[in-house]
Structure formats: structure tokens, C-alpha cells
């Protein structure tokens, strides 16, 4: 697979690491460290935006420590010396547990995500744009380190009051009848940025397609619910898009929603109340006829994770669930196109989306 | 770029075990099923087994099921096949594919297993 | 098991014949049937999934249809490069049987 951004990843690069970062930090870029904790040796971890390889120079420490209930330091370092540490009393990492850290460059700040969520600011104290150089050591094991750059237009999430020039922002900010979750969005008004993995290929197995237009994928360990996003180019015949997730033990329904403006051309809603898949599309408001068959017992189960693929075909959309076909819905919005909005919501964590 | 490799193919006595790797790459390996297909020299193709990465989720061909075993480890997109009490109607080119949901869309370029006293 | 009784097993055509190639089920299988094409030395190759549907890249003069539990694979102007042993699959339910396989030769 591809990441998108100008510079291209370290991947599963050996712990203690140090790489250049190319161009040095700009406003705007994006860094994603993606690993594991790990659970034997060691009680901390850091990550360091520095000039240099030797140290003494680093804009940014980030270091979880393992001790005292756990605790997240914040520091510069400038000439070998030490300022003054920024202590979070909150840890958002578990030993053992993977984990997607994100940082944001701003003019005044980084800003710091950790599965998703808004961790904490760290004010610059000295001008960003010295640093050239991430280093990771400690405690962690690392899968990648992706750049995202702010030049790379991204593909923009439905309801997102981010200008473009922004990096991708997840989740996007509701508006109107949405009603906004709790607990997911950050008191200011700074986007949560999530990194996007373009790979090669359009379509499983597609090597070619028209249009050419490469899926993003979403990695990350649990997604804000609801969850909206855009289908880049909407849909057309040979697209794919892969969910997957974990049905919460007390689930009772979700939904998988392909939207056209208003109109939702797909409403894909396992309902654990009624042990039924339904299938259904809504016009102006107006639901039409629900389809229920299957050809074996309901796939998804409370307490259990699934995939579900949904194939986008001249007629209809092919469904499989954990990798084995389950049904067929013939469109009944026809202008295939205009269906570019996903939307995700009810009793469940997601895990991965592409689209 | 989406690959398959097979490897550990090689030549065992009849009674003996091999294991069989596939190693994977270029895809979201855990949500893909990950078959094995045989084909005996100058015959036919016959599918051995499958594996659904994320759920652990298996099934066999009759001809393997007790002797052959699939497996798969998500953290290096590998999956492998156990054969144990292999006889001489084993001896075949085994491949593994992709399993897209609706077809075997990506094979491996085999390994020959050669089961011969 | 659901047996995929595949025929001709053989056939001769020349450049520019239309070739049908037939499958049928011992059992129903809704359309969940794919269609390979494999050359000498070389791993089979998709071409046709769910009875119809062609296989991204794959050229359009390889089509596929149903009708009940037989399903055929029809090439309308063969090709050089078509000439190979061709082998349906179901996919309904394990063990996911093929056919015997039809090898297309040159006449």
C-alpha cells in the first residue's frame, strides 16, 4: 500500500528509531506514528521532533510514562538543556495495546491525537520549522511512521466545516438534525485529523477501472460514531467499499447508509431486536419496500466483530459479510454517481474503513 | 501491489508432514479469505482449504480434512497449511488465492509438494 | 458436496469461434459460480464471478450466464491468447468444488 503525502513512511522501522523528516515540519503537516505498546520491558515511551541527530535540540518531546498511575511528560529541549515539563495526569495508552498517534503542526501549536481523539496541545517554544528529524525510543514496538502533507488534497468528509487547505479532519463536525455524540469532539474548534492510506488498486482485485480513483482507507483502532465520510467519485460499476468492526454486546440495531444528497440509496440496518438484515432505500423521506431474505442465519452477532463488503455493479450492489456473499440489492437510485456520502451509525465500534 | 508466495514445497516420504507458508501482501490481509488449491500433475485444480483471517474461521475438503491444517498469523500476513500423513495423491503444485468474495482473484505461483518414497 | 460436472473436457476451435463451455451443479448454487482461465506453468487467472459479472480487466468478449444449475462461460471471438484449460468453481458452500476443467486447444 501507498500513503498519501509527499514523503513515503517508515515502515515497521526498529525501535530506537531516527528518520528525517523531508522539507522539516510544516504548518499543516501531519505525522502518524502507528505501534504497540509493549507490555514487558521498560515503563516509557518517546516521540521527539528535534534538529538534528544528537538530541540536544528537540521541539517536541512526547513521552508516556508507565509510572506513578501513568502520566504523558511534554518538553522542549534546546542546547542539551531541559525547560520546563508539561505533565497530562491522563494516560491514553495501555501496555500491550496498539495505538495511532497523531501529530498536528500548526502555527502555534502541535497538536496531538491519540487514537482518534484530542489529546493534548503543546505551545511551540521554538520555531517548528528548525526540526528536521523525528526519533522514537523506549518501550514500543512501531508498525509506521506516515506523513501527511498539507498539499495533498484529501478527500473531504461529508458535513466538514474544515476548509480544504486543512489535512483530511475526522470525525466532521455534524450540522443541522445530527445530533452531536458525547465525548468525541474537542472543546476548541481544531479539527481531529486522521491520516489517509491511498493503496493501489481501485477495487479489490481491480488493477484497472474507470475512473481510476484509488480507495482511502481509514486505519485506525476505533472510529467517533456516528461516522460520515465521502465516497470520492461516488459510486460506479467495479467499486468496492470494506467496513468492519465490532457489534457492541448490547446491540440492538446499526446502519450502513449510502447517501445520495437527502436521499439514502442504501440503508443496510442488521437489527438484533428482530434477527433480520434490512435492506431498504429512502426517497424524499419516504422509505420503500424492505427486503429481508438471506440465504443462511443472520451473520452478524452481538459481541462479535464482522466485515461487511459492499460491491457496486451496473444493477445492484453485491453484499458479503466476513468475506462470503450474502445478498443482492437492485438500485433503485440509478445515477450511481451522486451516491458519494457513507455514512455509519448504531450499536457498533468500527474498526477499518475503505472506500 | 497485491502478492502472494507460496513456499516450503519440497519432496517428503509418504507418512510425513510439511508445512506450507503463504506469505501476503499489498492488502488488508485479516479480511480477506486465503485459500489453498491443488493441482496434481496434469489434472485438474482442487481446492484444499480456507482460512478467514480476523475470525480464525476454517473449512476443509474431505480429501485433507484430519490430516491438513490451515492457519494464519494477521500480525505477518501469512497464512499456512499443515499437511501431516501425506500419501502419494498429495503430490501436487499448491497454491494459495485471495478470496475476494465473489472469486479466487489473486494466486500465489505454487509450490510443488512431491510425496514419494 | 456440490459437484460441478464441467463439459466438453475438451474441444478444438480456431481464431475467431465462438466457444461455449458448460457447468452444471448437483445442486443449486444461486449464481455463486466464478469462471479461470489457466495457461501451462501458470496459476489460474479470474474471469467471471457470480455467473455473470466479468472480472475487472478481463476482456469482453468472455461473458458468462445461468440458467437454473447450469452455467456456461462463452468466449464470442476466441483469441490466440485464449487458447488454455478453463475451469468453473462454486462458491456457495464448502468445499468450494471446480470442475473438471475444458481445455481449449487450436484446430
Known amino acids: 500500500m501507498a500513503f498519501s503525502g509527499s514523503q513515503a513512511p517508515y515502515l515497521s522501522p526498529a525501535v530506537p528509531f531516527s528518520g528525517t523528516i523531508q522539507g522539516g515540519l510544516q504548518d499543516g503537516l501531519q505525522i502518524t506514528v502507528n505501534g504497540t505498546v509493549l507490555s514487558s520491558s521498560g515503563t516509557r515511551f518517546a516521540v521527539n521532533f528535534q534538529t538534528g541527530f544528537s538530541g540536544n535540540d528537540i521541539a517536541f518531546h512526547f513521552n508516556p510514562r508507565f509510572e506513578d498511575g501513568g502520566y504523558v511528560v511534554c518538553n522542549t529541549r534546546q542546547n542539551g538543556s531541559w525547560g520546563p515539563e508539561e505533565r497530562k495526569t491522563h494516560m491514553p495508552f495501555q501496555k500491550g495495546m496498539p495505538f495511532d498517534l497523531c501529530f498536528l503542526v500548526q502555527s502555534s501549536d502541535f497538536k496531538v491525537m491519540v487514537n482518534g481523539i484530542l489529546f493534548v496541545q503543546y505551545f511551540h517554544r521554538v520555531p517548528f520549522h528548525r526540526v528536521d528529524t523525528i526519533s522514537v525510543n523506549g518501550s514500543v514496538q512501531l508498525s509506521y511512521i506516515s506523513f501527511q502533507n498539507p498539499r495533498t488534497v484529501p478527500v473531504q468528509p461529508a458535513f466538514s466545516t474544515v476548509p480544504f487547505s486543512q489535512p483530511v479532519c475526522f470525525p466532521p463536525r455534524p450540522r443541522g438534525r445530527r445530533q452531536k455524540p458525547p465525548g468525541v469532539w474537542p472543546a476548541n474548534p481544531a479539527p481531529i485529523t486522521q491520516t489517509v492510506i491511498h493503496t493501489v488498486q481501485s477495487a479489490p482485485g481491480q488493477m484497472f477501472s474507470t475512473p481510476a480513483i484509488p480507495p482511502m482507507m481509514y486505519p485506525h483502532p476505533a472510529y467517533p460514531m456516528p461516522f460520515i465520510t465521502t465516497i470520492l467519485g461516488g459510486l460506479y460499476p467495479s467499486k468496492s467499499i470494506l467496513l468492519s468492526g465490532t457489534v457492541l454486546p448490547s446491540a440492538q440495531r446499526f446502519h450502513i447508509n449510502l447517501c445520495s444528497g437527502n436521499h439514502i440509496a442504501f440503508h443496510l440496518n442488521p437489527r438484533f431486536d428482530e434477527n433480520a438484515v434490512v435492506r431498504n432505500t429512502q426517497i424524499d423521506n419516504s422509505w420503500g419496500s424492505e427486503e429481508r431474505s438471506l440465504p443462511r442465519k443472520m451473520p452478524f452477532v452481538r459481541g462479535q466483530s464482522f466485515s461487511v463488503w459492499i460491491l457496486c455493479e451496473a444493477h445492484c450492489l453485491k453484499v458479503a459479510v466476513d468475506g462470503q456473499h450474502l445478498f443482492e440489492y437492485y438500485h433503485r437510485l440509478r445515477n450511481l454517481p451522486t451516491i458519494n456520502r457513507l455514512e455509519v451509525g448504531g450499536d457498533i465500534q468500527l474498526t477499518h474503513v475503505q472506500t | 501491489e497485491v502478492q502472494l508466495v507460496e513456499s516450503g514445497g519440497g519432496l517428503v516420504q509418504p507418512g510425513g508432514s510439511l508445512r506450507l507458508s503463504c506469505a501476503a501482501s499489498?492488502?488488508?490481509?485479516?479480511?480477506?479469505?486465503i485459500h489453498w488449491v491443488r493441482q496434481a500433475p496434469g489434472k485438474g485444480l482442487e481446492w484444499v482449504a480456507a482460512?478467514?483471517?480476523?475470525?480464525?474461521?476454517?473449512t476443509y475438503a474431505d480429501s485433507v480434512k484430519g490430516r491438513f491444517t490451515i492457519s494464519a498469523d494477521t500480525s505477518k500476513n501469512t497464512a499456512y497449511l499443515q499437511m501431516n500423513s501425506l500419501r502419494a495423491e498429495d503430490t501436487a503444485v499448491y497454491y494459495c488465492?485471495?478470496?475476494?468474495?465473489?472469486?479466487?482473484?489473486?494466486w500465489g505461483q505454487g509450490t510443488l509438494v512431491t510425496v514419494s518414497s | 458436496d456440490i459437484q460441478m460436472t464441467q463439459s466438453p473436457s475438451s474441444l478444438s476451435a480456431s481464431v475467431g469461434d465462438r466457444v461455449t463451455i458448460t457447468c452444471r451443479a448437483s445442486?443449486?448454487?444461486?449464481?455463486?459460480v466464478a469462471w479461470y482461465q489457466q495457461k501451462p506453468g501458470k496459476a489460474p487467472k479470474l474471469l467471471i464471478y457470480s455467473a455473470s459479472s466479468l472480472y475487472s480487466g478481463v476482456p469482453s468478449r468472455f461473458s458468462g450466464s445461468r440458467s437454473g444449475t447450469d452455467f456456461t462461460l462463452t468466449i464470442s471471438s476466441l483469441q490466440p491468447e485464449d487458447f488454455a484449460t478453463y475451469y468453473c468453481q462454486q462458491r456457495d458452500r464448502s468445499p468450494y468444488t471446480f470442475g473438471q476443467g475444458t481445455k481449449v486447444e487450436i484446430k
Open positions: 482460512i478467514f483471517p480476523s475470525g480464525g474461521i476454517t
Open positions: 488465492a485471495r478470496g475476494w468474495p465473489w472469486g479466487l482473484d489473486y
Open positions: 499489498g492488502f488488508t490481509f485479516r479480511y480477506y479469505w
Open positions: 445442486q443449486s448454487v444461486s449464481s455463486a
